[in-house]
């Protein structure tokens, strides 16, 4: 889906004027942006020698990190470049400017509606984690209709910047644990679950920790059934696969539907050299088709002794009387030699990639 870039994400190679001394500037950049921090001399007087520091450690200039007396540039920024930056007088170590920089996915995912605390105070002083917006964490019980999007937030800070992890009912919680997957927005200290279903009910705990301590907060989610609803497929399944000629492959598709879904495995085919019919509908052949009586179905497609003919685009499709959910995926089939060559080519390619 196209979500668009949110205005608060600072544009590529945008220069940001420095704050008044003693103030902390909170800045958000998009992944891949050029971070430019500017620290003019206080009162316009002479600057003297300066050093740029990130999270208490002096920055070493490199091809990507360009250090000047009044300006710092970090090219092709990534999440690792988030942190507390300061420009200091070399001799006195007096802080002339300091910035809290957070590098987020860009364009923004669109699920961070409020956004004001996207760049939290990471704190210049060393210290254990603490909540930066405790007033936003008062609502411990969340009851939402099924099919809605739920977002739990635990905005925190500390130095070094703490890590955040999530538990469901006291156990580690990962994307593969739920139909529809999850989105972890570490920069927003949030857990996002789209299209929630009754099985998402439970206690969700955020654990925020660094080497100086750990804090946690538990939310309870109740899902009010919005039924019937169209089928939901688990995010990331089925996954694309590459197989060697003659091998066996297996694809998984997890379907959630409270109304008996018709589940199909389909393969795109060509008819008379065309992939689509006169009306523009793709030609497909049905490989497997059945009706599931269970609310959650973990369905598999197994292809034995694959040949080059098996390569191509496939679909897992679930249909009930409300609507359809489908996921396309690819199978690439190579001879053993071709597979080896592909590994060599990938190795030689180094950092070159296709978008």
């Amino acid at each position: 889906e196209s979500l668009g870039t949110e205005q608060r994400v600072v544009g590529r190679a945008a220069e940001v004027p420095g704050p008044e001394p003693g103030q902390q500037e909170q800045l958000v950049f998009g992944s891949g942006d050029a971070v430019e921090l500017s620290c003019p001399p206080p009162g316009g007087g002479p600057m003297g020698p300066t050093v740029w520091v990130k999270d208490g450690t002096g920055l070493v200039p490199s091809e990507r990190v360009l250090v000047g007396p009044q300006r710092l540039q970090v090219l092709n920024a990534s999440h690792e470049d988030s942190g507390a930056y300061s420009c200091r007088q070399r001799l006195t170590q007096r802080v002339l400017c300091h910035f809290s920089v957070r590098v987020t996915d860009a364009p923004s995912s669109g699920d961070d509606e409020d956004g004001e605390d996207e760049a939290e105070d990471t704190g210049v002083d060393t210290g254990a984690p603490y909540w930066t917006r405790p007033e936003r964490m008062d609502k411990k019980l969340l009851a939402v209709p099924a099919a809605n999007t739920v977002r739990f937030r635990c905005p925190a800070a500390g130095n070094p910047t703490p890590s955040i992890s999530w538990l469901k009912n006291g156990r580690e919680f990962r994307g593969e644990h739920r139909i529809g997957g999850i989105k972890l927005r570490h920069q927003q200290w949030s857990l996002v679950m789209e299209s929630v279903v009754p099985s998402d009910r439970g206690n969700y705990t955020c654990v925020v920790e660094n080497k100086f301590g750990s804090i946690r907060q538990t939310y309870t989610l109740d899902v009010l059934e919005r039924s019937p609803h169209r089928p939901i497929l688990q995010a990331g399944l089925p996954a694309n696969q590459t197989a060697v000629l003659g091998s066996d492959v297996e694809f998984h598709c997890k379907v959630y539907s409270d109304a008996q879904p018709h589940i199909q495995w389909l393969k795109h085919v060509e008819v008379n050299g065309s992939k689509v019919g006169p009306d523009g509908t793709p030609y497909v052949t049905v490989l497997k088709s059945w009706i599931s009586e269970s609310v959650e179905a973990d369905v598999r497609l197994r292809l034995a002794n694959v040949s080059e003919r098996d390569g191509g685009e496939y679909l897992c499709r679930a249909t009930n009387f409300i609507g359809v959910a489908e996921k396309a995926f690819w199978l690439s089939v190579h001879g053993p030699r071709a597979a080896e060559e592909e590994l060599v080519e990938a190795d030689e390619a180094g950092s070159v990639y296709a978008g």
């Epitope: 019937p228 169209r230 409270d258 109304a259 008996q260 009306d279 509908t281 009706i291 009586e293 009387f321 409300i322 609507g323 359809v324 959910a325």
Partner: antibody, heavy 115, light 108 residues
Framework: QVQLQESGPGLVKPSETLSLTCTVS????????WSWIRQLPGKELEWIGH???????RYNPSLQSRVTISIDTSKNQFSLKLSSVTAADTAVYYC?????????WGQGTLVTVSS | EIVLTQSPGTLSLSPGERATLSCRTS???????LAWYQQKPGQAPRLLIY???RRATGIPDRFSGSGSGTDFTLTISRLEPEDFVVYYC?????????FGQGTKLEIK
């Protein structure tokens, strides 16, 4: 909350074509089935047909030769055309979400076939 | 096409009583593809039950559906004054999807 609203003329002359449009609000029309159902004066409910957001359709065989259902995803609308109408087509016409069983209905619009 | 026969045509009961509405199909319905709707005067029908026994959102638990094959039942455990309206069953397992003629629930 999904809402559906039928619109179109309430009076159609015999042998002409009945045309109704349903506007969907509160959700995208994509990935769902959308149906037309009518309720005849004797209160009998009759399924007319449905359309999927891709444009694929299924019609009641008893009406198939006269029915066309189309969809405009950019406007979040779908439409019904019923040709060569007679007095027997006088009914309250409902648009609804779902292919067969339906969970959301419009409030219905009465279409009278009369000269 | 599959014909649905609802019985009785009219059912007279008092508030607080239990109502049992029947729907019989001319052919077996695959996978319990049967729905029940409630229709109040001047309103569109409202989905109560789908899949023969699954309650739709917001439907009070006094409504329950059961049955399989050709015999299906809608049960209202304790009748409230607002329940005295018309009920339709519908099969959606085989096109054309067809409705019963309705059962009118009236206050005795």
């Amino acid at each position: 909350q999904v809402q559906l609203q039928e619109s179109g003329p309430g009076l159609v002359k015999p042998s002409e074509t009945l045309s109704l449009t349903c506007t969907v609000s509160g959700d995208s029309i994509n990935s769902y089935f959308w149906s037309w159902i009518r309720q005849l004066p004797g209160k009998e409910l009759e399924w007319i047909g449905h359309i999927y957001s891709s444009g694929s359709t299924r019609y009641n065989p008893s009406l198939q030769s006269r029915v066309t259902i189309s969809i405009d995803t950019s406007k979040n609308q779908f439409s019904l055309k019923l040709s060569s109408v007679t007095a027997a087509d006088t009914a309250v016409y409902y648009c609804a979400r779902g292919a067969s069983a339906v969970d959301y209905w419009g409030q219905g619009t009465l279409v009278t076939v009369s000269s | 096409e599959i014909v649905l026969t609802q019985s009785p045509g009219t059912l007279s009961l008092s508030p607080g009583e239990r109502a049992t509405l029947s729907c019989r199909t001319s052919q077996s319905i695959s996978s319990g593809y049967l729905a029940w709707y409630q229709q109040k005067p001047g309103q569109a029908p409202r989905l109560l039950i789908y899949g023969a026994s699954r309650r739709a959102t917001g439907i009070p638990d006094r409504f329950s559906g059961s049955g399989s094959g050709t015999d299906f039942t809608l049960t209202i455990s304790r009748l409230e004054p607002e329940d005295f309206v018309v009920y339709y069953c519908q099969q959606y397992g085989s096109s054309p999807y067809t409705f019963g003629q309705g059962t009118k629930l009236e206050i005795k």
